[in-house]
């Protein structure tokens, strides 16, 4: 099923890509290209008799195109508003600049202390899991070599079961690897919430009547940090998948050689153990630092907030994360409205349905209206 998150990612990536290109590109929005990218998400789903996906696609594409235009128009406006918001917030915090900086600093250290054990734990787990994966797979290679040495009558019948086991074990272990490593990203999310909540409480006395604006900035920070956690999860998952892609051909190679000559098979089996070790070791080396890099990124984001709220803030492109957050919120809200309607539609009569569709179109217009209306 196509998710709100997938749609929002396609839209945001497309928007960022356009924004990085010439300004004119943003003016002449290539609607067709965005439509193509969104339609591509539905490609696999429409093979099945899937009215839900078809219906969603029909309503989503116009909504997304309109939301995208709004995004381009409101980007500059939002940048101004965020700038203004920050100015007011800085002015309010200026008399307490040292205390604010110190509080954020304390929070930063607290965050580092909180996250460090998790990064260590992730590093240890990567190492342990990689070793376990190696230990699990190596015996299959050894077993096959032994069978070949003992030169059983029918190599196909006596080697194939081991190759089949190896094939399944590769997949099972990679799945387990993902299952054991991705929860760390979810743990990080909890720590982010706790840290930002503490920061909110410690800065509240200084913000006074600009509390709303402070909250808004902290929401932006939380969004960025959680996005990092999601990226960490995706990177771990992608690395595990890549490991699977590299290991699977090793089992296939053996199975392919079962039909060939014994010499090719001997060579393939002799190399199998080494290849397994090499790929697993490479995975370990690549993934071990993920936790620390993630921690650094989070610390950097909090450091940026300290600068933003400090007296000597430069021009920061901070509005983009707010823009992305709003885009994601809008798409999420579109999806949940659509799902609600979908479940209601099943019990509605045709006249009720038609009436509801009219209302839906009006609602869709409203949903697209002004991204992130900020009170100044």
């Amino acid at each position: 099923e196509v998710s709100a998150d997938q749609v929002a990612t396609v839209m945001w990536d497309y928007f960022s890509q356009l924004s990085n290109n010439a300004k004119e590109a943003v003016e002449h929005l290539q609607k067709s290209e965005l439509t193509q990218q969104l339609n591509a998400l539905f490609q696999d789903k429409l093979g099945e008799v899937n009215t839900y996906a078809g219906d969603l696609q029909k309503k989503l594409v116009p909504f997304a195109t309109e939301l995208h235009e709004r995004l381009a128009k409101d980007s500059e406006k939002l940048k101004e508003e965020i700038g203004k918001e920050l100015e007011e917030l800085r002015a309010r915090l200026l008399p307490h600049a040292n205390e604010v900086s110190q509080k954020i600093g304390d929070n930063l250290r607290e965050l580092q202390q909180r996250l460090e054990p998790y990064a260590d734990q992730l590093r240890t787990q990567v190492s342990t899991q990689a070793e376990q994966l190696r230990r699990q797979l190596t015996p299959y290679a050894q077993r096959m070599e032994r069978v070949l040495r003992e030169n059983a009558d029918s190599l196909q019948a006596s080697l194939r079961p081991h190759a089949d086991e190896l094939k399944a074990k590769i997949d099972q272990n990679v799945e387990e690897l993902k299952g054991r490593l991705t929860p760390y990203a979810d743990e990080f999310k909890v720590k982010i919430d706790q840290t930002v909540e503490e920061l909110r409480r410690s800065l509240a006395p200084y913000a006074q009547d600009t509390q709303e604006k402070l909250n808004h900035q902290l929401e932006g920070l939380t969004f960025q940090m959680k996005k990092n956690a999601e990226e960490l999860k995706a990177r771990i998952s992608a690395s595990a998948e890549e490991l699977r892609q590299r290991l699977a051909p090793l089992a296939e190679d053996v199975r392919g050689n079962l039909r060939g000559n014994t010499e090719g098979l001997q060579k393939s089996l002799a190399e199998l153990g080494g290849h397994l070790d090499q790929q697993v070791e490479e995975f370990r080396r690549r993934v071990e630092p993920y936790g620390e890099n993630f921690n650094k990124a989070l610390v950097q984001q909090m450091e940026q907030l300290r600068q933003k709220l400090g007296p000597h803030a430069g021009d920061v492109e901070g509005h983009l994360s707010f823009l992305e957050k709003d885009l994601r919120d809008k798409v999420n809200s579109f999806f949940s409205t659509f799902k609600e309607k979908e479940s209601q539609d099943k019990t509605l009569s045709l006249p009720e349905l038609e009436q509801q569709q009219e209302q839906q179109q009006e609602q869709q217009q409203e949903q697209v209206q002004m991204l992130a209306p900020l009170e100044s």
């Epitope: 077993r143 059983a152 029918s154 196909q156 019948a157 006596s158 194939r160 079961p161 081991h162 089949d164 086991e165 094939k167 399944a168 997949d171 099972q172 799945e175």
Partner: antibody, heavy 117, light 107 residues
Amino acid sequence: QVQLQQSGAELVKPGASVKISCKASGYAFSSYWMSWVKQRPGKGLEWIGQVYPGDGDTYYNGKFRGKATLTADKSSSTAYMQLSSLTSEDSAVYFCARRDNYCLDFWGQGTSLTVSS
Amino acid sequence: DIVMTQSHKFMSTSVGDRVSFTCKASQAVGSAVAWYQQKPGQSPKLLIYWASTRHTGVPDRFTGSGSGTDFTLTISSAQSADLADYFCQQCSTYPCTFGGGTKLEIK
């Protein structure tokens, strides 16, 4: 927990075909071979073959090649066995079973097939 | 095909007694042997794999041993709930093959 739910009993005429299903839950369906086993009263257990849902790969016991066709649908976590050109010899209980560590660690409840005119 | 021979078709024991089932492979299969229990009207259940590793949830009165061609399943203290057929199976060479089974009766 791992569960394999098979389709209900079948009564079919000689010469016909039948397709038995086995819906898996509680584990990563794509990453385990699914085996099929035949049991006739007084004849013990016979391994028919296996399918790998991850890529549709199959291996058949020579005795059942041409008789059984094994497939799997990842999206619904369901494995299928089609038996063709049925005769009374095919009357039996058929089990699907997940394969791991050179053994069949979880079994479906069985589907009884009766071939009779 | 590898033939798995369970020489006893039937075995009889009393509650609390020790009982052993044997299984002989027609050629060496290493340790890739499993044992199953099948109660009347039910599907087989895995008891032992890798010749001696107990499957999850299997009571410790069941133990497996052997390697190569000769394998044994032992129930240290038989219970009335153990009334069933017991099968051995190898899958280290295709096709996977089962023993003919031994029916355990409780006196």
